[in-house]
């Protein structure tokens, strides 16, 4: 028996359902009584779901997995994972045994989009050209970690005096805070771009300083 899975990682958004595809080619006369199917976490060997002795043995993994029972006889051994969490991310191995056995691993990549960044300025009044200001760009509830890029009004990257930190919440999602310290010119726009590297999603925030008032 030959097991086939997708070479590319399966990308799933947090709180959505994902299908980890796995298939085999059944011989003529194949019956489910002959099938042993096991899904497990590749690294830890933890059992996720199994089908043995002619029946679905159910989920061994937080009761959020299911097979496609009507499609098994056609060689579809795919696994459905419901309400995906950050902690589900990783490699899953599909083992199929009929007379001989084969296995293959499929990677699940979890993602969550970042919010539109909020911008804060310190100090935020009585600003003069030549003043040192701290601009903070904050974006929330994304996954995985974000890349943060700063640019000035002409699109020139600002790389000096940037400090970016990540905070992980209890669900494993990240809040990203990036701080730019810059000496003010006569006026100017400072923009931050928060990029989710998996989704290739860019979230933009900017602040324009033109004396008073400030524009966000």
């Amino acid at each position: 028996v030959e097991v086939q899975v997708s070479e590319d990682p399966v990308v799933a958004l947090v709180d959505t359902d994902a299908t980890l595809r796995c298939s085999f080619s059944p011989e003529p006369g194949f019956s489910l009584a002959q099938l042993n199917l096991i899904w497990q976490l590749t690294d830890t060997k933890q059992l996720v779901h199994s089908f043995t002795e002619g029946r679905d043995q159910g989920s061994a993994y937080s009761n959020r997995t299911a097979l496609f029972p009507d499609l098994l006889v056609q060689g579809n051994a795919s696994l459905r994972l419901q309400r995906v969490r950050v902690t589900d991310e990783g490699s899953y191995t599909c083992f199929v045994s009929i007379q001989d056995f084969d296995s293959a691993a499929v990677s699940l990549q979890v993602a969550a989009p970042y919010s539109k960044p909020s911008m804060t300025l310190e100090p935020n009044k009585d600003l003069r050209p030549g003043n040192m200001v701290t601009i903070t760009c904050s974006s929330y509830q994304g996954y995985p970690e974000a890349e943060v890029f700063w640019k000035d009004g002409q699109g020139v990257p600002l790389t000096g005096n940037v400090t970016t930190s990540q905070m992980a919440n209890e669900r494993g999602l990240f809040d990203v805070h990036s701080v730019l310290r810059v000496v003010l010119g006569a006026n100017g726009t400072y923009s931050c771009l928060v990029r989710n590297p998996v989704l290739q999603q860019d979230a933009h925030g900017s602040v324009t300083i033109t004396g008073q008032p400030l524009t966000f």
């Epitope: 690294d43 990677s107 990549q109 970690e145 992980a168 209890e170 494993g172 999602l173 990240f174 590297p197």
Partner: antibody
Framework: DVQLVESGGGVVRPGESLRLSCAAS????????MNWVRQAPGEGLEWVSR?????????YYADSVKGRFTISRDNSKNTLYLQMNSLRAEDTAVYYC?????????????WGLGTLVTVSS | EIVLTQSPGTLSLSPGERATLSCRAS??????LAWYQQKPGQAPRLLIY???TRATDIPDRFSGSGSGTEFTLTISSLQSEDFAVYYC??????????FGGGTKVEIK
């Protein structure tokens, strides 16, 4: 079994460079963030640098090494690196390679045995 | 930067006694705190993560508790192999991923 094996330590003079390597096995290397943690003789643990998983190469550094050290990884070789430039006497330490428990939970569930870096004139 | 303060610096106890180690964070870390054991000449070993979850193959005499800013590692009955240095580490916010200064548990 998870194994992390560091190499590349040695004795160098201040201002010189050194490149540390960490060979990983027993887990899907590309799926995990990796770190370097150091321990000066008789002192506590100090986190040095972290690189996130896959090929995204999002990196972080302790202030004490920022601009001098560069972390990188080669997922095809299951290897983590630390390029250390402009070394100082205060960089003398045992350097440990450590695997993050997951990408969002950065405790260190497996450690290498360490490699000693001595910076001395 | 989150600063972790461990106390006491040294704990002198006899085998069979209960050890209570403290780790205080300068700001809340939720439950994102880990404990490590390090013996002389060895790499650190993960004991506890998530403030209270024992790592793989860690005996149940080790337990962690606390959340927010106050955390405790308890060794219910010290064995000879438990005399070592113990470190706490936060992983809610980085860089840096900070460690406490350590508590040495020595034989009385």
């Amino acid at each position: 079994d998870v194994q992390l094996v560091e190499s590349g330590g040695g004795v160098v003079r201040p201002g010189e460079s050194l490149r540390l390597s960490c060979a990983a096995s027993g887990f899907t290397f590309s799926n995990y963030a990796m770190n370097w943690v150091r321990q000066a003789p008789g002192e506590g643990l100090e986190w040095v640098s972290r690189i996130n998983y896959k090929g995204y190469n999002i990196t972080y550094y302790a202030d004490s090494v920022k601009g001098r050290f560069t972390i990188s990884r080669d997922n095809s070789k299951n290897t983590l690196y630390l390029q250390m430039n402009s070394l100082r006497a205060e960089d003398t330490a045992v350097y440990y390679c450590a695997k993050s428990g997951s990408n969002s939970n950065n405790f260190f569930d497996y450690w290498g045995l360490g490699t000693l870096v001595t910076v001395s004139s | 930067e989150i600063v972790l303060t461990q106390s006491p610096g040294t704990l002198s106890l006899s085998p069979g006694e209960r050890a209570t180690l403290s780790c205080r964070a300068s700001q809340t870390v939720g439950s994102k705190l880990a404990w490590y054991q390090q013996k002389p000449g060895q790499a650190p070993r993960l004991l506890i993560y998530g403030a209270s979850t024992r790592a793989t193959d860690i005996p149940d005499r080790f337990s962690g508790s606390g959340s927010g800013t106050e955390f405790t590692l308890t060794i219910s009955s010290l064995q000879s192999e438990d005399f070592a240095v113990y470190y706490c580490q936060q992983y809610i916010n980085w860089p840096p991923l900070s460690f406490g200064g350590g508590t040495k548990v020595e034989i009385k």
